[in-house]
Amino acid sequence: PGPPAGSPRVSSDPRADLDSAVLLTRSLLADTRQLAAQMRDKFPADGDHSLDSLPTLAMSAGTLGSLQLPGVLTRLRVDLMSYLRHVQWLRRAGGPSLKTLEPELGALQARLERLLRRLQLLMSRLALPQAAPDQPVIPLGPPASAWGSIRAAHAILGGLHLTLDWAVRGLLLLKTRL
C-alpha cells in the first residue's frame, strides 16, 4: 500500500537516485570548468582569488574515506545554496565587465537550481532532514570595483569547481558502499 500519507517516500533504488544526482553534478562541473576557462581568457587571473563569504571546501585529506551519505548530501546542499547566492549576486552586481558572460552565468544558475532541486528530492526520498545552514546568511555587498567583481567571479567559479569535484567523488564513493 506504500508509505502513510505525509511521510517521505523512501526510494526503492537509492543507487539510481544517486546516479541522477551524480550526472547533474558532472554536467554542472563541465559547465563551471568551461565558464572558468572563459573567465581566464577574458580576464586573466593573477594567482589564487578568495572570497570570505564562500564556504570552505568540504574535503580535506582525511574526510573522503569516512563520508556518510546524510553528511555529504546535507553539506553539499548547504554549500551549493551559498554558491547559488553568489552567482545570483554576480549577475546582479557584477557590473559591465561581466555582462558579456551573462548568458553563461544565467545557464549556470539554472543548472545549479536544478541540481539543488534534485538533491532536495533525493534527501526527502532517503528521509533525511532538510538542514538549514549553520551560520546566518551574510548579505553580500557590492564589489569595491570592476576588478573586484572580476576577482570575485574567479573565486566563485574556482570554488564551485572544486566543490563539485568533491561532490562527484564523494557521491560515487558512497554509491560503491550502497
Epitope: 574535503m59 580535506s60 585529506a61
Partner: antibody, heavy 119, light 111 residues
Framework: EVQLVQSGAEVKKPGASVKISCKAS????????MDWVKQAPGQRLEWIGD????????IYNQKFTGRATLTVDKSASTAYMELSSLRSEDTAVYYC????????????WGQGTTVTVSS | DIVLTQSPASLALSPGERATLSCRAS??????????IHWYQQKPGQAPRLLIY???NLDSGVPARFSGSGSGTDFTLTISSLEEEDFATYYC?????????FGQGTKLEIK
C-alpha cells in the same frame, strides 16, 4: 609544455615500502586531480586512486585501500604514491596521470616508474 | 566493478586500411547524453596516450583519422586509414562509476 616527471626505478624486498614521486609542470597543479595507475606484466591497467591537489583529499580503489597512500606537496607541484607491504604481485610499472576533475580520463601521463619486488 | 572486454585481442592490418576496435562493458556506461568511455594508445616502453574522451571527443593533437562512437555497452574506436605510427596497443577505459577500469587491450599489428 605540460609534463609529469616520475622518480626512477626501484628494487624492493617483499614486505618493504616504496614511495614514487611525480613532478608536474606546465599547468596549474591544483586545476586537475592526480591519478595513479598500475600496469603489471601481462595484466590490464589498474586504477589505484587519485588525489585532489587543492585539498589533499585522496580516494582509493578498494583493492589498494590500506596499502596505497597518496599525498601531494602543493608548493613543489609534486604528487607521491607510497605502497606498503610489498609482494611479488606489486612488480609493475606505476604511472601518475593528470585527471580531469569529476570525469577520470587521463590526458597527460608520467613516463612510468618500474618497481620490482624480489627477495 | 564494471568489466570492459575488448575485441579482437589482436588485429593484423596494412597501412592505409581501416581499423575497427570494439569495447563492450558489462553494464551501461552511458547516462543522459554522456558516455563515460575513453580510448588510449600505448606503444612498447611508453606511457598510454589519451586519444578519445567521453566516447567521441578527440583529444588535442590527435589526428582526425581517429574517431570514437557508441553508447550504452558497445563502443568502437575507428582509425579511418592506418599510418605506420598507429600500430600499437589500444585500451578502452570507463569512468561511469568508481573504480574506473580498463579493457585488456587490442594489439594492432602490421600485416
Amino acid at each position: 609544455e605540460v609534463q609529469l616527471v616520475q622518480s626512477g626505478a626501484e628494487v624492493k624486498k617483499p614486505g618493504a615500502s616504496v614511495k614514487i614521486s611525480c613532478k608536474a609542470s606546465g599547468y596549474t597543479f591544483t586545476d586537475y586531480n592526480m591519478d595513479w595507475v598500475k600496469q603489471a606484466p601481462g595484466q590490464r591497467l589498474e586504477w589505484i586512486g587519485d588525489i585532489n591537489p587543492h585539498s589533499g583529499g585522496p580516494i582509493y580503489n578498494q583493492k589498494f585501500t590500506g596499502r596505497a597512500t597518496l599525498t601531494v606537496d602543493k608548493s613543489a607541484s609534486t604528487a607521491y604514491m607510497e605502497l606498503s607491504s610489498l609482494r611479488s604481485e606489486d612488480t609493475a610499472v606505476y604511472y601518475c596521470a593528470r585527471g580531469e576533475l569529476g570525469h577520470w580520463y587521463f590526458d597527460v601521463w608520467g613516463q612510468g616508474t618500474t618497481v620490482t619486488v624480489s627477495s | 566493478d564494471i568489466v570492459l572486454t575488448q575485441s579482437p585481442a589482436s588485429l593484423a592490418l596494412s597501412p592505409g586500411e581501416r581499423a575497427t576496435l570494439s569495447c563492450r562493458a558489462s553494464k551501461s556506461v552511458s547516462t543522459s547524453g554522456y558516455s563515460y568511455i575513453h580510448w588510449y594508445q600505448q606503444k612498447p616502453g611508453q606511457a598510454p596516450r589519451l586519444l578519445i574522451y567521453l566516447a567521441s571527443n578527440l583529444d588535442s593533437g590527435v589526428p582526425a583519422r581517429f574517431s570514437g562512437s557508441g553508447s550504452g555497452t558497445d563502443f568502437t574506436l575507428t582509425i579511418s586509414s592506418l599510418e605506420e605510427e598507429d600500430f600499437a596497443t589500444y585500451y578502452c577505459q570507463h569512468s561511469r562509476d568508481l573504480p574506473p577500469t580498463f579493457g585488456q587491450g587490442t594489439k594492432l599489428e602490421i600485416k
